[in-house]
């Protein structure tokens, strides 16, 4: 993906081209900083917490910091879903939520963020060196995940302060690449403002060299470089994980994949898909590692007005309150 | 996209009951929130009964005692027993799904018609 940016002339302008070069270097500036004011980079918090009153039960909070629309969150423990970590719960805003035992109550508590409580009976129950990760999928942004475990020491009705330890995956690759041009635009306009606003008034002479402008080009990573951000999931490995769980989900993913609609999940690839897959453009962003985007470009519908069942800022928790006649 | 349809509407005397149900077609994952609205004529729109997945129900004021909302054995399937009917429970009772519970896609059935009366 290459992508090129007219710069203006280092040479004074010829007569007659002052309106157009300066037309040029105003266009530019625009949309560099349009650019920059664009790019931000998404994090996933999780934070998990036990229960004060039954010392086996977990409540795990995750939440997505980025302006994409969420189409998928996936909780997983034992380690990062796809990399030996095992499904506890997947909600989807639009179809709904689905969750595995010994996930007890999957829900969402805003627009972003969502918190499953597990039981603590059982072989099944977690304990306390488990990690669980929370996978969002999102558009533009892609697939971010993070995963956040109860410290060792923690007291019961402690929880662990939220970590944004997001896990750097394959289908990131081109959103890194796309932030670098981004990163270069930002500072290249800084410079370009910082030079106009230096520069001398130019003289009105002919140009002794080529009328052509020479071009300044900002590229994506090659793939050398591409390869090189492809980072392994950290694999995590605890002592706690029921082996009972893992037959039932050998890679983490569960056997729906197929049933969702395309532009909601397909089955994720395995690793040795990533360096031979190449990385989409933007616009039509497709997650390498899950492929969770087969029409990215679309956005959720709005809800008619005045049919929504709770569209109270306060989530579905306001259900729990006295009910209001809408 | 979800798909719901009512049935069990029909012509009932004051103080009948009726049962309405309410098959939705996700069923691999659940819909956070079912619920039931109705629409007498000309008038809003009103809500009447909800439930989540989890078994949390709601009613309005007005059908507390007589009407009981669950959620079916078979999965996304919803109900209404309306009992103790008035001539004011006249109205198209649609059903609903909300299935985050944040209001971002919200569906509805086609409607089905009560109608009490002597």
């Known amino acids: 993906m290459r992508t090129e940016a007219q710069v203006p002339a280092l040479q004074p302008p010829e007569p007659g081209l002052e309106g157009a070069m300066g037309h040029r270097t105003l266009v530019l500036p625009w949309v560099l900083l349009t650019l920059c004011v664009t790019a931000g980079t998404p994090e996933v918090w999780v934070q998990v917490r036990m229960e004060a009153t039954e010392l086996s039960s977990f409540t795990i909070r995750c939440g997505f910091l980025g302006s994409g629309s969420i189409s998928l969150v996936t909780v997983s423990w034992g380690g990062p879903n796809g990399a030996g970590g095992t499904t506890l719960a997947v909600l989807h805003p639009e179809r709904g939520i689905r969750q595995w035992a010994p996930a007890r109550q999957a829900r969402w508590e805003t627009q972003s963020s969502i918190s499953l409580i597990l039981e603590g009976s059982g072989a099944s129950s977690p304990c306390a060196n488990t990690t669980f990760c929370c996978k969002f999928a999102s558009f533009p942004e892609g697939s971010w995940e993070a995963c956040g475990s109860l410290p060792p020491s923690s007291d019961p009705g402690l929880s662990a302060p939220p970590t944004p330890a997001p896990i750097l995956r394959a289908d990131l690759a081109g959103i890194l690449g796309v932030s670098g041009v981004l990163l270069f635009g930002c500072v290249y306009l800084l410079h370009l403002l910082r030079r106009h606003k230096h520069r001398p008034a130019p003289r009105l002479q002919p140009s002794r060299t080529s009328p052509q402008a020479p071009r300044a080009r900002a590229w994506a990573p090659s793939q050398a470089s591409q390869a090189a951000l492809h980072v392994p999931y950290a694999t995590i490995n605890t002592s706690c994980r029921p082996a009972t769980l893992d037959t039932a989900h050998p890679h983490g993913g569960p056997s729906w994949w197929a049933s969702l609609p395309t532009h909601a999940a397909h089955r994720p690839q395995g690793p040795a898909a990533w360096a031979s897959t190449p990385i989409p453009a933007r616009g039509s962003f497709v997650s390498v590692e899950n492929g969770l985007y087969a029409q990215a470009g679309e956005r959720p519908p709005h809800t008619g007005p005045g049919l929504t069942l709770f569209p109270d800022p306060r989530g579905p928790r306001a259900m729990e309150g006295p009910l209001g006649v809408r | 996209e979800v798909q719901l349809v009512e049935s069990g509407g029909g012509l009932v005397q004051p103080g009948g009951s009726l049962r309405l149900s309410c098959a939705a077609s996700e069923t691999y994952f659940d819909l956070y929130v079912m619920g039931w609205y109705r629409q007498a004529p000309g008038k809003d729109r009103e809500l009447v009964a909800t439930?989540?997945?989890?078994?949390?129900?709601k009613y309005v004021d007005s059908v507390k005692g007589r009407f009981t909302i669950s959620r079916g054995d078979a999965k996304n399937s919803l109900s209404l027993q309306m009992n103790s009917l008035r001539a004011e429970d006249t109205a198209v009772y649609y059903c609903?799904?909300?299935?985050?519970?944040?209001?971002?896609?919200?569906?509805w059935g086609q409607g089905t018609m009560v109608t009490v009366s002597s």
């Open positions: 609903n799904a909300d299935p985050s519970g944040l209001g971002r896609k919200v569906y």
């Open positions: 439930i989540t997945y989890t078994g949390s129900i």
